[in-house]
């Protein structure tokens, strides 16, 4: 903590300049009033500030907003913004695009993936809902920070929305927010034509139940083996080896080379061998044949 | 334009460990696999094993099992493969290289980056 | 594993000369899993054709491949001085993945 010491006369502050950058520590803690720093700060990201000096300004915000700052300061902090915890991050209410947006701009280039996302999180907080303008911001500012939210935050996408997602967007999305997205996806691209939709739906698929698989496997989509092994095991699993035939179209022999990757290895395991080898692939792993399958959690769930 | 970024060359003593991270850029890093590729000096190449970026699985060749381990930064677009206990039969050039999912072959090979493991 | 033996191990030839390298399979791969590569002395390996006998993007039309079952070869139809090199095939037909040893032409 920087020690306190009174401000010689000569140093008093009256307005935030580049003279400050001569200051030290000490008299930067001493002949900076806070009130005054966040009035004027949108002067500060223009001065060249040492890290040093930047950590002084950041304690003298800190103790004039113990609860958080406001977001006259906040929009203003430019490259103060890389000194921010996500604590400090999560006392703040932020409802402007154009503060999320210089924000994401100072932080491009800097590891602060954890700032970003509390970043977010607070402006989702703040406007209340996952709307289309904060949807477009995040694409265009921050590729992949969509991904950062929490299920919880993202369920408040309205379907609406889901088409200004692109499919670089949700690269980083993991199993439980594509559970959430894939049923707003399907209720926004509903009335699409079967190709059409296929594109659209494509990148959402990780969140696909089983039966919409099937469905899918029906429309003579030929999915890629990208896509594939993006699907939830669960989904994969229960589908016949016909099923996956007609999915995967001509994409089908791709089986070969991820046989060892799951989710194909473990569908493998439960297919029958005489079933894999209809494929012609040389996949090795089925049931043999004339072995029973006996489905214990079937049993369990009876007893 | 796609490109695959190794780290410069690395000498470590014998049995340390060595971690070489493999930037992508220029596509979709989760549409491909990363397998990684050692060439002993003037010799042949040998198949390591590969992480699908995507769901972060992992295949190993049985003789680099335990040898390799091989982790994925999705937000970083970045790969690392681990080499554990090295000694001299470890000194090579290790290769990342891109393989689309559910294809065998290596479009776009990485720089390559030297491990030299020396006392 | 399947081990793939290509021979020569060393050859030369002049500008303008038809080039064949073969490449050799312990046992049977399905031909749309075997690929070929390019390497030059520094460089990291180029594709140079996939799936037994399509050329990747960008090599020169003079670059051929064919075979099946456990012979494959490529074929270079007029030798030029910047086909100097070392050439690798490649299977993904049967687990663990494998390289063959090497072919290094040199031009004369």
């Known amino acids: 903590d920087v020690e306190r010491t009174t401000c010689p006369p000569e140093k008093e502050v009256h307005e935030i300049d580049e003279s400050l950058i001569f200051y030290k520590k000490r008299e930067l803690e001493a002949c900076v009033d806070a009130a005054l720093l966040a009035a004027q700060m949108d002067r500060v990201d223009a001065i060249p500030f040492t890290y040093e000096q930047l950590d002084v300004l950041k304690h003298k915000l800190d103790e004039l907003y113990p609860q958080g700052y406001p977001e006259s300061v906040i929009r203003h902090l430019g490259h103060l913004f890389l000194k921010m915890s996500p604590e400090d991050i999560r006392k703040w209410n932020v409802t402007s695009l154009e503060t999320l947006k210089a924000l994401l701009k100072v932080s491009k280039g800097h590891e602060m993936s954890a700032q970003v996302a509390t970043l977010i999180d607070r402006v989702v907080v703040g406007r209340g809902q996952l709307d289309k303008d904060t949807v477009d911001t995040l694409t265009a500012f921050c590729p992949g920070c969509l991904c950062s939210l929490s299920p919880e935050r993202l369920s408040s996408v309205p379907p609406s929305v889901i088409g200004a997602v692109r499919p670089q967007d949700l690269d980083t999305c993991g199993p439980r927010q594509l559970d959430v997205l894939y049923p707003k996806a399907r209720l926004a691209f509903q009335n699409m034509s079967g190709s059409e939709y296929f594109v659209k739906i494509r990148p959402f698929l990780g969140g696909a139940p089983t039966e919409d698989v099937k469905a899918l496997s029906q429309q003579n989509v030929s999915m890629d083996l990208a896509t594939f092994m993006k699907l939830r095991r669960e989904a994969v699993l229960p589908l016949t080896v016909a099923e996956v035939q007609k999915l995967l179209g001509p994409h089908v022999e791709g089986l070969k080379v991820e046989e060892q990757h799951s989710p194909v290895r473990d569908w493998i395991l439960k297919q029958r061998q005489d079933d894999l080898d209809t494929l012609g692939l040389g996949l090795q792993g089925g049931i043999p044949n004339g072995y029973l399958i006996l489905d214990l959690s079937v049993r369990e769930a009876l007893s | 334009e796609v490109q695959l970024q190794q780290s410069g060359p690395e000498l470590v003593k014998p049995g340390a460990s060595v971690k070489i991270p493999c930037k992508a850029s220029?596509?979709?890093?989760?549409?491909?696999?990363m397998d990684w590729v050692k060439q002993s000096h003037g010799k042949s190449l040998e198949w390591i094993g590969d992480?699908?970026?995507?769901?972060?699985?992992?295949i190993y060749n049985q003789k680099f099992n335990g040898k390799a381990t091989l982790t994925e930064d999705k937000s970083a677009s970045t790969v690392y493969m681990e080499f554990r206990s090295l000694t001299s039969d470890d000194t090579a050039v290790y290769y990342c290289?891109?393989?689309?999912?559910?294809?065998?072959?290596?479009?776009?090979w990485g720089t390559g980056t030297t491990v030299t493991v020396s006392s | 594993q399947i081990v793939l033996t290509q021979s020569p191990a060393l050859m030369s030839a002049s500008p303008g000369e038809k080039v064949t390298l073969t490449c050799s399979a312990s046992?049977?791969?399905?031909?749309?899993?075997l690929s070929w590569y390019q390497q030059k002395p520094g460089s990291s390996p180029k594709l140079l054709i996939y799936?037994?006998?399509n050329l990747a993007s960008g090599v020169p039309a003079r670059f051929s491949g064919s075979g099946s079952g456990t012979s494959y070869s490529l074929t270079i139809s007029s030798m030029e001085a910047e086909d100097a090199a070392s050439y690798f095939c490649?299977?993904?037909?049967?687990?663990?993945?494998?390289f063959g040893g090497g072919t290094k032409l040199e031009i004369k």
């Open positions: 799936r037994t006998s």
């Open positions: 220029g596509y979709t890093f989760t549409d491909y696999n």
């Open positions: 490649h299977q993904w037909s049967s687990f663990p993945y494998t």
């Open positions: 290289a891109r393989r689309r999912i559910g294809t065998g072959y290596f479009d776009v």
């Open positions: 046992s049977s791969v399905i031909s749309s899993y």
């Open positions: 992480i699908n970026p995507s769901t972060g699985g992992t």
